[in-house]
Interface confidence: low
């Protein structure tokens, strides 16, 4: 008798995940009797992926009728191929008996399943930091297959050069995930900046996946503080004003001093936003100078973000009234703390 | 700055229908797959399914197949979700939720939420 | 449907304190697990995603770890503000699943 082939004509097969891969499989001859059975992997610890006589295989069907007269054709097709289901699959004659004995194997049909990125995920640093420190952002993608991919970092367009990026596993795997760090230097104008994790796969069929992250959940814009003084007005009362400007986030408290004592406490909220997404903050307090015998220190004190306390003081001459005193004159910068952390 | 800003509490008779409205502000709306997710009085947080906002096309979970359907109106970057029919086990508080990629059909994490509309179903 | 289980359904704590949520998923569901935090009368806050990653903004007290199906979240150093009701989610396999909660309360 002519010897018996099974023939795996496609050494392998590369699908999209979600759809079907059909696996060919013929026999050259119909003697023996004996099933058909496909199997992924070899050795004992294959893994029974079709049997015509029993089991339940939902996602796998004959793609002839194999219980035909004179069927030699064994292929199946299995459906919602996922990247679990890569591997390498394996047709096998059975001859009929009491248990049924293996006779001959096919070569094998490598599937490959392709399977996109998941959508790039952008995560920031934990705690704000501030202009010139450079910061650490994490781009993850995962389940895709195969392992080549490109990822990309921009910010505001322009492509980053300080990344890190590895792929994982480095061996053969059914899928692959890629981390990517940048590191990005701030500056006070990125309020509004973005950076853009972009993510290129065969799969993606030249429409890359994206992920963004804002800097401004990054980055804080510490303020720029000025006391000045106004005229004097004819009742006796001087109009100090303390403007805050160019900070981010919002989150500030200013605190009015008199000779150290706490005048009043204010907290910004709802603020214009300027330009660059940073605001400005203007607060004032009226001093009764006819109530002091001396000269008055006053001090704006600004806390902002959960930040060390920032001073700048002024000291309004009691002396020189009740004439009018020059306006618009610049406070001096006292104290502790009071250097200008821009 | 991102947010997804709903429609407001909503009370109904039983047999009646509702429709909860999710406005995507701060973001592209098709950019992100939309669910929604139901918690019941005192319970906790249940997925009712999600519509993929690029092709429209909607994925309910097993118990909200039939009287739940979920839309969108790209033009005013809104999201819907409507109940017909409605029972009294039908009174919660209904949160749409982003999820980080419509490409991702395995769903995702929701990185922002809804205030929730509150729907309450009495006679 | 995978099942979500939370351990334990509430907790007494001191401001200060360290404290330990639990997480079990009843199939494997790789690192696709996510944490929220919800306050009477709001809606959920997003915590960690992909069981280990902070979101931007989330103080760095809050950390996530785990794998496959035991994941835990772990809050040092709790402030008056982390008193609420956490839950975790699988996002690995259809339909999404949370578990039933966890209420972290003032001791």
């Known amino acids: 008798e002519e010897e018996l082939q099974v023939i795996q004509p496609e050494k392998s097969v590369s699908v999209a995940a979600g759809d079907s891969a059909t696996l060919n499989c013929t026999v050259s001859s119909l003697i023996p009797v004996g099933p058909i059975q496909w199997f992924r992997g070899a050795g004992p610890g294959r893994e029974l992926i079709y049997n015509l006589k029993e089991g339940h295989f939902p996602r796998v069907t004959p793609v002839s009728d194999p219980t035909k007269r004179n069927n030699m054709d064994f292929s199946i097709r299995i459906s919602n191929i996922t990247p679990a289901d890569a591997g390498t699959y394996y047709c096998v004659k059975f001859r009929k008996g009491s248990p049924d004995v293996e006779l001959k194997s096919g070569a094998g049909t490598e599937l490959s399943v392709r399977a996109k990125p998941s959508a790039p995920v952008v995560s920031g640093p934990a705690v704000r930091a501030t202009a010139e420190h450079t910061v650490s952002f994490t781009c993850e993608s995962h389940g895709f297959s195969p392992r080549d991919i490109t990822l990309k970092w921009f910010k505001n367009g322009n492509e980053l050069s300080d990344v890190q990026t590895n792929v994982d596993p480095a061996g053969k795997s059914v899928s692959y995930s890629i981390r990517s760090t940048a590191r990005v230097v701030l500056t006070r104008r990125d309020v509004h900046s973005q950076v853009i994790c972009e993510v290129a796969h065969v799969t993606l069929q030249g429409d890359p996946l994206r992920g963004t992250a804002n800097l401004s959940e990054a980055i804080r814009v510490p303020p720029f503080l000025e006391v000045t003084q106004q005229s004097m007005r004819a009742d006796n009362q001087v109009n100090v004003t303390c403007q805050v400007t160019k900070f981010y986030p919002q989150r500030l408290q200013l605190t009015w001093l008199e000779n150290g004592n706490v005048s009043r406490t204010e907290m910004a909220s709802a603020l214009p936003e300027n330009k660059d997404g940073t605001y400005n903050w203007t607060s004032w307090l009226l001093v009764n100078v006819s109530a002091h015998r001396d000269d008055v220190k006053l001090t704006c004190q600004v806390e902002h973000d959960g930040q060390p306390a920032v001073n700048k003081s002024f000291s309004v001459k009691v002396s020189a009234h009740p004439k009018e005193q020059g306006s618009n004159t610049a406070a001096e910068n006292t104290g502790t703390n009071e250097r200008n952390i821009y | 700055q991102i947010q997804l800003v709903q429609s407001g509490s909503e009370l109904k008779k039983p047999g009646a229908s509702v429709k909860v409205s999710c406005r995507a502000r701060g973001y592209t709306l098709t950019d992100y797959a939309m669910n929604w997710v139901r918690q019941a009085p005192g319970q906790g947080l249940e997925w009712m399914g999600f519509?993929?906002?690029?092709?429209?096309?909607?994925t309910y979970a097993q118990g909200f197949k039939g009287r739940f359907v979920f839309s969108l109106d790209t033009s005013v970057s809104t999201a819907y979700l409507q109940i017909g029919s409605l029972k009294a086990e039908d009174t919660a508080v209904y949160y749409c939720?982003?999820?980080?990629?419509?490409?991702?059909?395995?769903?995702?994490?929701?990185?922002?939420w809804g205030q929730g509309t509150l729907v309450t179903v009495s006679s | 449907d995978i099942q979500m289980t939370q351990s334990p359904s509430s907790l007494s704590a001191s401001v200060g304190d360290r404290v330990t949520i639990t997480c079990r998923a009843s199939?494997?569901?790789?690192?696709?697990l996510a944490w929220y935090q919800q306050k009477p009368g709001k809606s959920p806050k997003a915590l960690i995603f992909s069981a280990i990653y902070r979101y931007i903004g989330v103080p760095s007290r809050f950390s996530g770890s785990g794998s496959g199906t035991d994941f835990t979240l772990t809050i040092s150093n709790l402030q008056p503000e982390d008193f609420a009701t956490y839950y975790c989610?699988?996002?690995?396999?259809?339909?999404?699943?949370f578990g039933q909660g966890t209420k972290l309360e003032i001791k």
């Open positions: 199939q494997n569901v790789g690192t696709h």
């Open positions: 519509i993929n906002t690029y092709t429209g096309e909607p």
């Open positions: 939720a982003r999820t980080r990629g419509y490409y991702d059909f395995d769903g995702g994490a929701f990185d922002y």
């Open positions: 989610q699988q996002y690995n396999t259809y339909p999404l699943t």
